[in-house]
């Protein structure tokens, strides 16, 4: 009679974390009599996974009924697989002996590989806002994946970025891995509507990468440009002066009118107009009564934007002669008004 062979038909088995792995094993003969044991690894340090004869193995079930006398199928199922279960599993036939059973023949082994999905990438930007032309860093993190091979790409509005550094931890063996990437992005004035995207591709995702996004609206600060103009005379002794605040982001803005250095009025931007690029425009106007004023008046529009140091623009109002038109109102809205008599 031909000597018993232990056949493990699968060289490798690939299982997703949390699923059940089936490790197949058959014997070609009922003789010699003796139990089957399953081990992970070979040699003296091997780990017992299942013993037909004795022991408690809560995660392991047998595919067939091993108590039947003519059974030659010794396949097992291991439940709730994690990457810690990865390794080569050997089905080993023992011969009944006294006092101990003796190892008789081993299968060729089945390599169990475990896959675990990466978490959705988390993208975070700088703690403080930055202005156009500055370079800011974004980080992307994803965790808990296996195997270690992973691809990470950065995009800004669909255009792939090249200035980034990526680390996968740990470098050595582990049951799961993390990826961390830092990308550098140069801001432009048009970036209020822009998005930075981190894309992670892994074997577990079946060609459908995970994406994490950050909106540059949370990162960018576009400082305003100011223009102060004198409008046509509304009455013989009145001059209307406007301050046009253009192309700013975010909306948080406070405007102060100064007359010869003295605070005349302070107001907060409320009813703003939005530009196509996401920035805002706003206009404030001041009605000045110059009838009794002998000297020229220096009007200053001072703007504090998003907690930054104030910027200002001044306009000299000539009161010696009849006020002439010195500009035109180009803004869409008049949101603030104030009438001042100067004595």
């Amino acid at each position: 009679e031909e000597e018993l062979q232990v056949i493990q038909p699968d060289k490798s088995v690939l299982v997703a974390a949390g699923e059940t792995a089936t490790l197949r094993c058959t014997a070609t003969s009922l003789i010699p009599v003796g139990p089957i044991q399953w081990f992970r690894g070979a040699g003296p340090g091997r780990e017992l996974i299942y013993n037909q004869k004795e022991g408690h193995f809560p995660r392991v079930t047998t595919v067939s009924d091993l108590t039947k006398r003519n059974n030659m199928d010794f396949s097992i199922r291991i439940g709730n697989i994690t990457p810690a279960d990865a390794g080569t599993y050997y089905c080993v036939k023992f011969r009944k002996g006294s006092p101990d059973d003796v190892e008789f023949k081993s299968g060729a082994g089945t390599e169990l590989s475990v896959r675990a999905k990466p978490s959705a990438p988390v993208v975070s930007g700088p703690a403080a806002r930055a202005t156009p032309q500055h370079t800011v860093s974004f980080t992307c993190e994803s965790h808990g994946f296996s195997p270690r091979d992973i691809t990470l790409k950065w995009f800004k509005n669909g255009n792939e970025l090249s200035d980034f550094q990526t680390n996968v931890d740990p470098v050595g063996e582990s049951v799961s891995y993390s990826i961390h990437s830092t990308a550098k992005v140069v801001l432009t004035r048009e970036d209020v509507h822009s998005q930075v995207i981190c894309e992670v591709a892994h074997v577990t995702l079946q060609g459908d990468p995970l994406r994490g996004t950050a909106n540059l609206s949370e990162t960018i600060r576009v400082p305003p440009t100011l223009e102060v103009t004198q409008q046509p005379v509304r009455a013989e002794n009145q001059v209307n002066v406007t301050c046009q605040v253009r192309k700013f982001y975010p909306q948080r803005l406070q405007l102060t009118w100064l007359e010869n250095g003295n605070v005349s009025r302070t107001e907060t931007a409320s009813t703003v107009t939005e530009n196509k690029d996401g920035t805002y425009n706003w206009m404030s106007w001041l009605l000045v009564n110059v009838s009794a004023h002998r000297d020229d008046v220096k009007l200053t529009c001072q703007v504090e934007h998003d907690g930054q140091p104030a910027v200002s623009k001044s306009h000299d109002l000539k009161v010696s002669a009849h006020p002439k038109e010195q500009g035109s109102n180009t803004a869409a809205e008049n949101t603030g008004s104030n009438e001042r008599n100067i004595y």
């Epitope: 988390v122 994803s142 965790h143 680390n167 740990p170 050595g172 961390h180």
Partner: antibody, heavy 117, light 107 residues
Framework: DVQLQESGPGLVKPSQSLSLTCTVT?????????WHWIRHFPGNILEWMGY???????NYNPSLKSRISITHDTSKNHFFLRLNSVTAEDTATYYC??????????WGQGTLVTVSA | DIVMTQSPATLSVTPGDRVSLSCRAS??????LHWYHQKSHESPRLLIK???QSISGIPSRFSAGGSGSDFTLTINSVEPEDVGVYYC?????????FGGGTKLEIK
């Protein structure tokens, strides 16, 4: 803001099991990251004990592998440490932490566990 | 396991001093080295990741460098609140391991 808070008995008898809970606020542990336990022995010795991933995969320091278990309950946003067969050598301040990659970004305030009869 | 060794064990400085703390790994760990600061009765706080990358919210006086097995943390101008213990950590290979710490004291 992400915050972690350890809780559990401050005194454990030798040979018994030490069980600690880490309550996470400000971030759902099922969304990502690795969730670690680290302990601090007297004399400025820090030891990483192990972690559990967002998806429930655990990884342990080989020096503790035979007696440690880290699990989580994502519905309560808790993760847990269980250390079996403790001795006086396990007396330490135990911290839970959120892992970045191979580093620890957020830490709990720590809880002192004394092993004594 | 990778063994991390820090020196000196204690450093006594005057406010305004520039100080350097050393960390050595028992084998090359590339740039996978992270620094923490722990004040008395507080949790450790991440200062630097990947040998030299700054962390948001950490003062700019903290900088670091090195690669392979030798690393340095520099405090440009020490302030009184910088007292405490500084730890380096291997982030290259499991298990993650920490140095024994450098205690910074103010004279």
């Amino acid at each position: 803001d992400v915050q972690l808070q350890e809780s559990g008995p401050g005194l454990v008898k030798p040979s018994q099991s030490l069980s600690l809970t880490c309550t996470v606020t400000g971030f759902s542990i099922s969304r990502g990251y690795d969730w670690h336990w680290i302990r601090h022995f007297p004399g400025n010795i820090l030891e990483w004990m192990g972690y559990i991933t967002y998806s429930g995969i655990s990884n342990y320091n080989p020096s503790l592998k035979s007696r440690i278990s880290i699990t989580h309950d994502t519905s309560k946003n808790h993760f847990f440490l269980r250390l079996n067969s403790v001795t006086a050598e396990d007396t330490a301040t135990y911290y839970c932490a959120r892992g970045g990659g191979a580093w620890f970004t957020y830490w709990g305030q720590g809880t002192l566990v004394t092993v004594s009869a | 396991d990778i063994v991390m060794t820090q020196s000196p064990a204690t450093l006594s400085v005057t406010p305004g001093d520039r100080v350097s703390l050393s960390c050595r790994a028992s084998q090359s760990i590339s740039d996978s080295l992270h620094w923490y600061h722990q004040k008395s009765h507080e949790s450790p706080r991440l200062l630097i990741k990947y040998a030299s990358q700054s962390i948001s919210g950490i003062p700019s006086r903290f900088s670091a460098g090195g690669s392979g097995s030798d690393f340095t943390l520099t405090i440009n101008s020490v302030e009184p609140e910088d007292v405490g213990v500084y730890y380096c950590q291997n982030g290259h290979s499991l298990p993650w391991t920490f140095g024994g710490g450098t205690k910074l004291e103010i004279k």
